[in-house]
Protein backbone atom coordinates (compact mmCIF):
# COMPACT_ATOMS: atom_id res chain seq x y z
CA UNK A 1 0.00 0.00 0.00
CA UNK A 2 1.19 3.53 -0.75
CA UNK A 3 1.90 6.03 2.00
CA UNK A 4 0.82 9.65 1.87
CA UNK A 5 4.28 10.84 0.85
CA UNK A 6 4.06 9.03 -2.46
CA UNK A 7 0.75 10.66 -3.23
CA UNK A 8 1.92 14.13 -2.29
CA UNK A 9 4.85 13.93 -4.71
CA UNK A 10 2.61 13.74 -7.74
CA UNK A 11 -0.47 15.63 -6.58
CA UNK A 12 0.66 18.95 -7.98
CA UNK A 13 1.28 17.47 -11.42
CA UNK A 14 -2.39 16.55 -11.68
CA UNK A 15 -3.68 20.00 -10.89
CA UNK A 16 -3.25 21.39 -14.38
CA UNK A 17 -5.39 18.70 -15.92
CA UNK A 18 -8.36 19.48 -18.11
CA UNK A 19 -10.51 16.41 -18.46
CA UNK A 20 -12.88 15.97 -21.42
CA UNK A 21 -13.06 19.71 -21.76
CA UNK A 22 -13.90 20.26 -18.10
CA UNK A 23 -11.57 21.09 -15.25
CA UNK A 24 -11.92 20.19 -11.57
CA UNK A 25 -13.48 22.67 -9.20
CA UNK A 26 -11.52 21.48 -6.16
CA UNK A 27 -9.09 18.72 -5.25
CA UNK A 28 -7.93 17.17 -2.03
CA UNK A 29 -6.35 14.08 -0.52
CA UNK A 30 -8.37 11.78 1.72
CA UNK A 31 -8.36 8.23 2.95
CA UNK A 32 -11.30 6.06 2.00
CA UNK A 33 -12.94 3.64 4.39
CA UNK A 34 -16.13 1.62 4.49
CA UNK A 35 -19.19 2.24 6.63
CA UNK A 36 -17.74 -0.34 9.03
CA UNK A 37 -14.37 1.46 9.17
CA UNK A 38 -12.37 -0.94 7.06
CA UNK A 39 -9.72 0.79 4.99
CA UNK A 40 -9.49 0.81 1.20
CA UNK A 41 -5.88 0.01 0.34
CA UNK A 42 -3.91 -0.27 -2.87
CA UNK A 43 -1.07 -2.69 -3.55
CA UNK A 44 1.27 -3.21 -6.49
CA UNK A 45 1.20 -6.87 -7.58
CA UNK A 46 2.73 -8.21 -10.78
CA UNK A 47 3.00 -4.73 -12.29
CA UNK A 48 -0.67 -3.93 -11.70
CA UNK A 49 -2.49 -2.47 -8.76
CA UNK A 50 -4.94 -4.39 -6.62
CA UNK A 51 -7.58 -2.81 -4.41
CA UNK A 52 -8.31 -4.32 -1.00
CA UNK A 53 -10.79 -3.71 1.78
CA UNK A 54 -9.13 -4.57 5.07
CA UNK A 55 -8.67 -3.83 8.75
CA UNK A 56 -5.44 -1.95 9.34
CA UNK A 57 -3.13 -2.60 12.24
CA UNK A 58 -3.27 0.06 14.94
CA UNK A 59 -0.43 2.33 13.77
CA UNK A 60 -0.56 1.44 10.08
CA UNK A 61 -0.89 4.47 7.80
CA UNK A 62 -4.00 4.76 5.68
CA UNK A 63 -3.60 5.05 1.93
CA UNK A 64 -4.63 8.38 0.45
CA UNK A 65 -6.60 9.07 -2.68
CA UNK A 66 -6.63 12.29 -4.66
CA UNK A 67 -10.27 13.26 -5.12
CA UNK A 68 -10.90 15.65 -7.99
CA UNK A 69 -14.37 17.18 -7.98
CA UNK A 70 -16.21 18.18 -11.13
CA UNK A 71 -19.55 19.85 -11.73
CA UNK A 72 -21.96 17.94 -13.89
CA UNK A 73 -24.21 19.94 -16.15
CA UNK A 74 -27.09 17.71 -15.05
CA UNK A 75 -29.14 19.07 -12.16
CA UNK A 76 -29.04 17.37 -8.79
CA UNK A 77 -32.26 16.06 -7.31
CA UNK A 78 -30.72 16.05 -3.84
CA UNK A 79 -31.22 19.05 -1.61
CA UNK A 80 -28.07 20.61 -0.30
CA UNK A 81 -25.70 19.59 -3.07
CA UNK A 82 -24.98 23.08 -4.29
CA UNK A 83 -26.59 26.45 -4.80
CA UNK A 84 -26.79 25.79 -8.51
CA UNK A 85 -28.30 22.35 -7.99
CA UNK A 86 -25.52 20.83 -10.08
CA UNK A 87 -24.48 17.24 -9.49
CA UNK A 88 -20.93 16.65 -8.39
CA UNK A 89 -18.75 14.01 -9.95
CA UNK A 90 -15.40 12.76 -8.69
CA UNK A 91 -12.41 10.93 -9.99
CA UNK A 92 -10.26 8.98 -7.54
CA UNK A 93 -6.52 8.57 -8.02
CA UNK A 94 -4.39 6.75 -5.44
CA UNK A 95 -1.14 7.17 -7.33
CA UNK A 96 0.23 9.02 -10.32
CA UNK A 97 -1.52 8.28 -13.63
CA UNK A 98 -3.83 5.65 -12.11
CA UNK A 99 -7.57 6.13 -11.59
CA UNK A 100 -10.39 4.01 -10.28
CA UNK A 101 -12.47 2.70 -13.16
CA UNK A 102 -15.88 1.09 -13.39
CA UNK A 103 -15.75 -2.12 -15.41
CA UNK A 104 -19.44 -2.58 -16.02
CA UNK A 105 -19.03 -5.84 -17.93
CA UNK A 106 -17.22 -7.55 -15.06
CA UNK A 107 -19.07 -5.61 -12.33
CA UNK A 108 -15.66 -4.73 -10.95
CA UNK A 109 -13.73 -1.67 -9.81
CA UNK A 110 -10.22 -1.53 -11.22
CA UNK A 111 -7.20 0.74 -11.24
CA UNK A 112 -6.26 1.73 -14.75
CA UNK A 113 -3.34 3.74 -16.01
CA UNK A 114 -4.80 6.57 -18.08
CA UNK A 115 -3.90 9.50 -20.16
CA UNK A 116 -6.13 12.53 -20.34
CA UNK A 117 -8.84 13.01 -21.26
CA UNK A 118 -10.08 10.42 -18.78
CA UNK A 119 -12.82 8.09 -19.99
CA UNK A 120 -16.32 8.33 -18.55
CA UNK A 121 -15.68 5.09 -16.62
CA UNK A 122 -13.38 7.06 -14.30
CA UNK A 123 -16.14 9.44 -13.22
CA UNK A 124 -18.53 8.78 -10.35
CA UNK A 125 -21.50 10.84 -9.26
CA UNK A 126 -21.07 11.81 -5.61
CA UNK A 127 -23.99 11.37 -3.21
CA UNK A 128 -23.97 12.72 0.33
CA UNK A 129 -25.58 10.10 2.55
CA UNK A 130 -26.44 9.84 6.24
CA UNK A 131 -23.84 9.47 9.02
CA UNK A 132 -21.42 11.62 7.02
CA UNK A 133 -21.03 8.91 4.44
CA UNK A 134 -20.84 9.24 0.68
CA UNK A 135 -21.61 6.91 -2.18
CA UNK A 136 -20.18 6.78 -5.68
CA UNK A 137 -22.52 6.12 -8.60
CA UNK A 138 -21.12 5.16 -12.00
CA UNK A 139 -21.47 7.94 -14.52
CA UNK A 140 -21.68 5.33 -17.27
CA UNK A 141 -24.28 3.17 -15.55
CA UNK A 142 -26.81 5.03 -13.39
CA UNK A 143 -28.07 2.97 -10.48
CA UNK A 144 -24.76 1.11 -10.19
CA UNK A 145 -22.53 2.05 -7.27
CA UNK A 146 -19.06 1.27 -5.97
CA UNK A 147 -19.57 -1.19 -3.13
CA UNK A 148 -17.86 -3.82 -1.02
CA UNK A 149 -18.10 -7.50 -1.85
CA UNK A 150 -15.85 -10.24 -0.41
CA UNK A 151 -13.21 -7.81 0.83
CA UNK A 152 -12.90 -6.18 -2.58
CA UNK A 153 -14.51 -3.23 -4.29
CA UNK A 154 -17.18 -4.20 -6.80
CA UNK A 155 -20.00 -2.59 -8.75
CA UNK A 156 -23.36 -3.11 -7.09
CA UNK A 157 -26.74 -2.49 -8.70
CA UNK A 158 -29.12 -0.54 -6.47
CA UNK A 159 -32.71 -1.20 -7.46
CA UNK A 160 -34.59 1.35 -5.37
CA UNK A 161 -33.96 4.52 -3.43
CA UNK A 162 -34.43 2.65 -0.14
CA UNK A 163 -31.38 0.55 -0.95
CA UNK A 164 -29.24 3.69 -1.31
CA UNK A 165 -28.59 3.41 2.40
CA UNK A 166 -27.29 -0.16 2.14
CA UNK A 167 -24.11 -0.23 4.19
CA UNK A 168 -21.99 -1.90 1.53
CA UNK A 169 -22.17 1.12 -0.79
CA UNK A 170 -21.46 3.70 1.91
CA UNK A 171 -17.97 5.12 2.35
CA UNK A 172 -16.27 7.61 4.65
CA UNK A 173 -13.72 10.20 3.59
CA UNK A 174 -11.14 11.26 6.13
CA UNK A 175 -8.11 13.52 6.01
CA UNK A 176 -6.33 11.48 8.69
Amino acid sequence: AFGISGVQKYTRALHDSSITGISPITEYLASLSTYNDQSITFALEDESYEIYVEDLKKDEKKDKVLLSYYESQHPSNESGDGVDGKMLMVTLSPTKDFWLHANNKEHSVELHKCEKPLPDQAFFVLHNMHSNCVSFECKTDPGVFIGVKDNHLALIKVDSSENLCTENILFKLSET
Partner: antibody
Protein backbone atom coordinates in the same frame (compact mmCIF):
# COMPACT_ATOMS: atom_id res chain seq x y z
CA UNK B 1 -34.08 31.15 0.78
CA UNK B 2 -30.47 30.26 1.60
CA UNK B 3 -29.38 32.49 4.47
CA UNK B 4 -26.78 32.95 7.22
CA UNK B 5 -27.39 35.26 10.18
CA UNK B 6 -24.61 36.06 12.66
CA UNK B 7 -25.28 37.19 16.22
CA UNK B 8 -23.28 37.69 19.42
CA UNK B 9 -21.02 40.59 18.54
CA UNK B 10 -20.52 43.59 20.80
CA UNK B 11 -18.09 45.58 22.91
CA UNK B 12 -15.78 43.49 25.09
CA UNK B 13 -12.75 44.29 27.23
CA UNK B 14 -9.30 42.88 26.39
CA UNK B 15 -8.89 39.41 27.89
CA UNK B 16 -12.63 38.81 27.78
CA UNK B 17 -14.64 36.11 26.02
CA UNK B 18 -17.46 36.17 23.49
CA UNK B 19 -19.40 33.52 21.59
CA UNK B 20 -20.61 34.22 18.07
CA UNK B 21 -23.45 32.23 16.52
CA UNK B 22 -24.43 31.81 12.90
CA UNK B 23 -27.92 30.49 12.16
CA UNK B 24 -28.23 28.77 8.78
CA UNK B 25 -31.41 28.16 6.81
CA UNK B 26 -32.49 27.07 3.33
CA UNK B 27 -29.97 24.27 2.80
CA UNK B 28 -28.80 20.94 4.22
CA UNK B 29 -26.44 22.35 6.83
CA UNK B 30 -24.51 19.14 7.59
CA UNK B 31 -23.48 18.74 3.94
CA UNK B 32 -21.38 21.88 3.97
CA UNK B 33 -18.15 22.98 5.56
CA UNK B 34 -18.39 26.40 7.18
CA UNK B 35 -15.89 29.16 7.93
CA UNK B 36 -15.50 32.35 9.90
CA UNK B 37 -13.85 35.26 8.09
CA UNK B 38 -13.17 38.64 9.67
CA UNK B 39 -12.45 42.15 8.44
CA UNK B 40 -10.87 44.79 10.64
CA UNK B 41 -12.12 48.36 10.01
CA UNK B 42 -10.70 49.63 6.72
CA UNK B 43 -8.66 46.45 6.19
CA UNK B 44 -8.82 43.34 4.04
CA UNK B 45 -10.43 39.95 4.59
CA UNK B 46 -8.79 37.51 7.02
CA UNK B 47 -9.80 33.86 7.19
CA UNK B 48 -10.19 32.84 10.84
CA UNK B 49 -11.40 29.26 11.11
CA UNK B 50 -13.17 26.44 9.29
CA UNK B 51 -15.02 23.26 10.20
CA UNK B 52 -16.02 20.26 8.08
CA UNK B 53 -19.64 19.28 7.61
CA UNK B 54 -19.51 16.62 10.31
CA UNK B 55 -17.56 18.82 12.70
CA UNK B 56 -14.78 16.23 12.77
CA UNK B 57 -12.11 18.46 11.20
CA UNK B 58 -11.33 21.99 12.36
CA UNK B 59 -8.79 24.53 11.13
CA UNK B 60 -7.51 27.84 12.51
CA UNK B 61 -5.46 30.83 11.45
CA UNK B 62 -2.21 31.11 13.39
CA UNK B 63 -3.37 34.42 14.85
CA UNK B 64 -6.29 32.79 16.73
CA UNK B 65 -5.00 29.27 17.39
CA UNK B 66 -5.37 28.32 21.04
CA UNK B 67 -7.76 31.21 21.73
CA UNK B 68 -10.71 30.60 19.39
CA UNK B 69 -12.78 27.42 19.01
CA UNK B 70 -15.09 26.70 16.09
CA UNK B 71 -17.95 24.25 16.51
CA UNK B 72 -21.30 23.38 15.00
CA UNK B 73 -24.60 21.85 16.03
CA UNK B 74 -26.06 20.20 12.95
CA UNK B 75 -29.32 19.47 14.75
CA UNK B 76 -29.79 23.22 15.28
CA UNK B 77 -28.30 24.33 11.94
CA UNK B 78 -25.96 26.62 13.85
CA UNK B 79 -22.26 27.45 13.64
CA UNK B 80 -20.35 28.87 16.62
CA UNK B 81 -17.11 30.71 17.31
CA UNK B 82 -15.98 30.78 20.93
CA UNK B 83 -13.48 33.61 21.34
CA UNK B 84 -11.33 33.73 24.48
CA UNK B 85 -8.43 35.97 25.57
CA UNK B 86 -9.62 38.67 23.19
CA UNK B 87 -7.17 41.33 22.04
CA UNK B 88 -7.56 44.77 20.49
CA UNK B 89 -6.39 43.33 17.17
CA UNK B 90 -9.40 40.97 17.14
CA UNK B 91 -11.66 43.99 16.55
CA UNK B 92 -13.43 43.31 13.26
CA UNK B 93 -16.66 42.46 11.51
CA UNK B 94 -16.99 38.67 11.71
CA UNK B 95 -18.69 36.90 8.79
CA UNK B 96 -19.76 33.29 8.66
CA UNK B 97 -19.51 31.76 5.21
CA UNK B 98 -20.69 28.56 3.58
CA UNK B 99 -18.77 26.58 1.00
CA UNK B 100 -20.11 26.39 -2.52
CA UNK B 101 -20.43 22.65 -2.92
CA UNK B 102 -21.85 20.03 -0.60
CA UNK B 103 -18.64 18.04 -0.30
CA UNK B 104 -18.44 18.34 3.49
CA UNK B 105 -14.72 19.13 3.29
CA UNK B 106 -13.40 22.67 3.72
CA UNK B 107 -11.49 22.87 0.43
CA UNK B 108 -13.93 25.05 -1.45
CA UNK B 109 -14.88 28.63 -2.20
CA UNK B 110 -17.46 30.60 -0.18
CA UNK B 111 -20.77 31.26 -1.93
CA UNK B 112 -23.03 32.32 0.96
CA UNK B 113 -22.01 35.01 3.44
CA UNK B 114 -23.85 36.44 6.42
CA UNK B 115 -24.25 40.17 6.96
CA UNK B 116 -21.51 40.14 9.60
CA UNK B 117 -21.44 40.99 13.30
CA UNK B 118 -19.10 43.62 14.75
CA UNK B 119 -16.79 42.65 17.61
CA UNK B 120 -15.04 45.56 19.32
CA UNK B 121 -12.29 44.78 21.84
CA UNK B 122 -11.49 47.88 23.86
CA UNK B 123 -11.07 49.01 27.44
CA UNK C 1 1.30 29.46 5.75
CA UNK C 2 0.65 30.17 2.08
CA UNK C 3 0.92 33.89 1.38
CA UNK C 4 -1.15 35.39 -1.45
CA UNK C 5 0.24 38.58 -2.95
CA UNK C 6 -2.14 40.66 -5.05
CA UNK C 7 -0.99 43.29 -7.51
CA UNK C 8 -1.41 46.06 -8.17
CA UNK C 9 -2.71 47.44 -4.88
CA UNK C 10 -4.83 49.97 -6.76
CA UNK C 11 -5.90 50.00 -10.40
CA UNK C 12 -7.18 53.31 -11.82
CA UNK C 13 -9.20 52.73 -14.97
CA UNK C 14 -12.12 54.14 -16.92
CA UNK C 15 -15.40 52.37 -17.69
CA UNK C 16 -15.05 50.23 -20.82
CA UNK C 17 -11.38 49.50 -20.18
CA UNK C 18 -9.91 46.07 -19.47
CA UNK C 19 -8.77 45.24 -15.94
CA UNK C 20 -6.15 42.60 -15.20
CA UNK C 21 -5.63 41.65 -11.57
CA UNK C 22 -2.86 39.33 -10.40
CA UNK C 23 -2.63 36.95 -7.45
CA UNK C 24 0.59 35.08 -6.69
CA UNK C 25 0.85 32.27 -4.13
CA UNK C 26 4.03 31.58 -2.16
CA UNK C 27 3.62 27.87 -2.97
CA UNK C 28 1.37 25.85 -5.24
CA UNK C 29 -2.34 25.81 -4.45
CA UNK C 30 -3.24 23.84 -7.58
CA UNK C 31 -6.63 25.04 -8.78
CA UNK C 32 -7.97 25.69 -5.28
CA UNK C 33 -8.30 29.45 -5.64
CA UNK C 34 -11.27 31.80 -5.78
CA UNK C 35 -11.92 35.50 -6.41
CA UNK C 36 -14.35 37.82 -4.59
CA UNK C 37 -15.69 41.30 -5.15
CA UNK C 38 -16.49 43.53 -2.18
CA UNK C 39 -18.21 46.90 -2.11
CA UNK C 40 -18.26 49.23 0.93
CA UNK C 41 -20.61 48.05 3.68
CA UNK C 42 -21.35 44.76 1.93
CA UNK C 43 -20.27 41.15 2.37
CA UNK C 44 -17.94 39.75 -0.30
CA UNK C 45 -19.46 38.16 -3.42
CA UNK C 46 -18.00 35.07 -5.07
CA UNK C 47 -16.95 35.65 -8.68
CA UNK C 48 -14.64 32.77 -9.62
CA UNK C 49 -13.91 29.40 -8.00
CA UNK C 50 -11.60 26.55 -8.95
CA UNK C 51 -9.36 29.21 -10.55
CA UNK C 52 -11.47 29.50 -13.70
CA UNK C 53 -15.13 28.64 -13.01
CA UNK C 54 -17.53 31.56 -13.00
CA UNK C 55 -20.10 31.53 -10.19
CA UNK C 56 -23.78 31.53 -11.08
CA UNK C 57 -25.08 34.95 -12.05
CA UNK C 58 -21.64 36.46 -12.63
CA UNK C 59 -21.42 38.27 -15.99
CA UNK C 60 -19.12 36.71 -18.59
CA UNK C 61 -16.93 39.81 -18.66
CA UNK C 62 -15.32 38.29 -15.54
CA UNK C 63 -12.87 35.46 -16.18
CA UNK C 64 -10.23 33.66 -14.14
CA UNK C 65 -7.15 31.78 -15.23
CA UNK C 66 -4.01 30.18 -13.84
CA UNK C 67 -2.96 27.25 -11.70
CA UNK C 68 -0.19 26.46 -9.26
CA UNK C 69 1.17 29.81 -8.08
CA UNK C 70 0.08 32.43 -10.63
CA UNK C 71 -3.53 33.49 -11.13
CA UNK C 72 -5.30 36.26 -13.01
CA UNK C 73 -8.75 37.81 -12.79
CA UNK C 74 -9.71 39.67 -15.94
CA UNK C 75 -12.62 42.06 -16.38
CA UNK C 76 -12.90 42.49 -20.14
CA UNK C 77 -14.87 45.75 -20.14
CA UNK C 78 -15.35 47.62 -16.89
CA UNK C 79 -18.90 48.60 -16.05
CA UNK C 80 -19.64 51.32 -13.46
CA UNK C 81 -20.74 48.67 -10.94
CA UNK C 82 -17.39 46.84 -11.21
CA UNK C 83 -15.46 49.48 -9.27
CA UNK C 84 -14.79 47.72 -5.97
CA UNK C 85 -12.13 45.79 -4.05
CA UNK C 86 -11.20 42.31 -5.30
CA UNK C 87 -9.70 39.53 -3.17
CA UNK C 88 -8.19 36.17 -4.05
CA UNK C 89 -8.53 33.27 -1.59
CA UNK C 90 -6.73 29.93 -1.48
CA UNK C 91 -8.19 26.76 0.02
CA UNK C 92 -5.55 24.18 -0.77
CA UNK C 93 -4.91 21.23 1.52
CA UNK C 94 -2.44 23.18 3.62
CA UNK C 95 -4.54 25.12 6.14
CA UNK C 96 -4.54 27.85 7.23
CA UNK C 97 -6.50 29.11 4.25
CA UNK C 98 -5.62 32.67 3.31
CA UNK C 99 -6.82 35.74 1.43
CA UNK C 100 -4.75 38.15 -0.61
CA UNK C 101 -4.43 41.76 0.50
CA UNK C 102 -6.88 42.97 -2.14
CA UNK C 103 -6.80 45.11 -5.27
CA UNK C 104 -8.90 48.25 -5.40
CA UNK C 105 -10.30 49.05 -8.84
CA UNK C 106 -11.14 52.74 -8.87
CA UNK C 107 -12.48 55.15 -11.46
CA UNK C 108 -9.76 57.11 -13.21
Amino acid sequence: EVQLVETGGGLIQPGGSLRLSCAASGFTFSSYAMSWVRQAPGKGLEWVSAISGSGGSTYYADSVKGRFTISRDNSKNTLYLQMNSLRAEDTAVYYCARTLHGIRAAYDAFIIWGQGTLVTVSS
Amino acid sequence: EIVLTQSPGTLSLSPGERATLSCRASQSVGINLSWYQQKPGQAPRLLIYGASHRATGIPDRFSGSGSGTDFTLTISRLEPEDFAVYYCHQYSQSPPFTFGGGTKVEIK
